[in-house]
């Protein structure tokens, strides 16, 4: 019979013969022959292959370097890579999460719109009229100005986006 020019899914062509690929988690030891099947071997410790393959070496699991602020989110297996995430207070600098940076703080006059996660930074927003933030924080939202009226007081000093209003007693002298 004519030697094949293409092979089925999960097979590869070598020496005019279709051989089975190795399944995820296993590497190629030797190609099949007319008389023998493909020989595969499971990946070793800290190694993986995540596709049907003919690789002779497995890939190393990603190392979550604590010096870069990284920690293991999900331990790798023979079929999956390790997933890293950042330590508390830090977030990934890229989708691949190869290093981390400290969460940004929102300056006075700005509040936290969205708290940072392991993969996204803090999102800040300017405090609108009626709200203020007088601290630099990665967690604090803009606070509403104090309502002097509800305390039976009057505004003695107007608030800003960075300061609260100052309330004082009502002037009791009437004309």
């Amino acid at each position: 019979p004519e030697p094949p020019t293409a092979c089925r899914e999960k097979q590869y062509l070598i020496n005019s013969q279709c051989c089975s690929l190795c399944q995820p988690g296993q590497k190629l030891v030797s190609d099949c022959t007319e008389f023998t099947e493909t020989e595969c071997l499971p990946c070793g410790e800290s190694e993986f292959l995540d596709t049907w393959n003919r690789e002779t070496h497995c890939h190393q699991h990603k190392y979550c370097d604590p010096n870069l602020g990284l920690r293991v989110q999900q331990k790798g297996t023979s079929e999956t890579d390790t997933i890293c995430t950042c330590e508390e207070g830090w977030h990934c600098t890229s989708e691949a999460c190869e290093s981390c940076v400290l969460h940004r703080s929102c300056s006075p006059g700005f509040g936290v719109k969205q708290i940072a996660t392991g993969v996204s930074d803090t999102i800040c927003e300017p405090c609108p009229v009626g709200f203020f933030s007088n601290v630099s924080s990665a967690f604090e939202k803009c606070h509403p100005w104090t309502s002097c009226e509800t305390k039976d007081l009057v505004v003695q000093q107007a608030g800003t986006n960075k300061t609260d209003v100052v309330c004082g007693p009502q002037d009791r002298l009437r004309a």
């Epitope: 022959t33 008389f35 023998t36 099947e37 020989e39 595969c40 071997l41 499971p42 331990k75």
Partner: antibody, heavy 120, light 111 residues
């Protein structure tokens, strides 16, 4: 019908040697990985050694490494286990087992076993 | 001491379901989907019941099923029958140089 028939077991003194054979029939021998698995009397199973279909790749448990040698003769459909420097703890029924396709870590057909007794 | 931990015995009545656990580590059961289960009747050779965690070889009843969560694999037998009374061994590939490890075996008694 797949058949595996072990032979070569017996009584041997500590430090002695034995060669086990496993005659295979009912399948294309060279297409399957093969293993030896043993079971001490009244105990559990212990994988001993394996070889790929071609016989080039061989694998051994730590407990037998350097003392046992697995080999195969595909022209004779026979698997072998050469056991040297035998110890009392090697006493067991030795099973020849066929690897499931090319996966020698699964055993889909087993022989009836041959008893190896190491004693003085 | 076995590398994989199984209960020494389990029992069930005909028609019931039973589950046998097999606990390993992140170096074996947790790392590989290369878990298998064997049934062994007294004086007989073992028989492959499950491979690759949950795959049944042809000819094995669908009353036998396998699963895995983390570092523990399980064999479930539903609709227990008297013929199911036997020893059951789990096995896994391992990252250690021992390559293949077994559990100590579980004796199943059908009451």
């Amino acid at each position: 019908e797949v058949q595996l028939l072990e032979s070569g077991g017996g009584l041997v003194q500590p430090g002695g040697s034995l060669r086990l054979s496993c005659a295979a029939s009912g399948f294309t021998f060279s297409r399957n990985a093969m293993s030896w698995v043993r079971q001490a009397p009244g105990k559990g199973l212990e994988w001993v050694s394996a070889t790929g279909g071609s016989g080039i790749s061989t694998y051994y448990a730590d407990s037998v490494k350097g003392r046992f040698t697995i080999s195969r003769d595909n022209s004779k459909n026979t698997l072998y286990l050469q056991m040297n420097s035998l110890r009392a703890e090697d006493t067991a029924v030795y099973y020849c087992a066929r690897g499931y396709s090319n996966s020698w870590w699964y055993f889909d057909y087993w022989g009836q076993g041959t008893l190896v007794t190491v004693s003085s | 001491q076995s590398a994989l931990t199984q209960p020494a015995s389990v029992s069930g009545s005909p028609g019931q379901s039973i589950t046998i656990s097999c606990t390993g580590t992140s170096s074996d059961v947790g790392n590989y989907n290369l878990v298998s289960w064997y049934q062994q009747h007294p004086g007989k050779a073992p028989k492959l019941m499950i491979f690759e965690v949950n795959q049944r070889p042809s000819g094995v009843s669908n009353r036998f099923s396998g699963s895995k969560s983390g570092t523990t694999a399980s064999l479930t037998i539903s609709g227990l029958q008297a013929a199911d009374e036997a020893d059951y061994f789990c096995s896994s590939y391992t990252t250690s140089s021992t390559y293949v490890i077994f559990g100590g075996g579980t004796k199943l008694t059908v009451l």
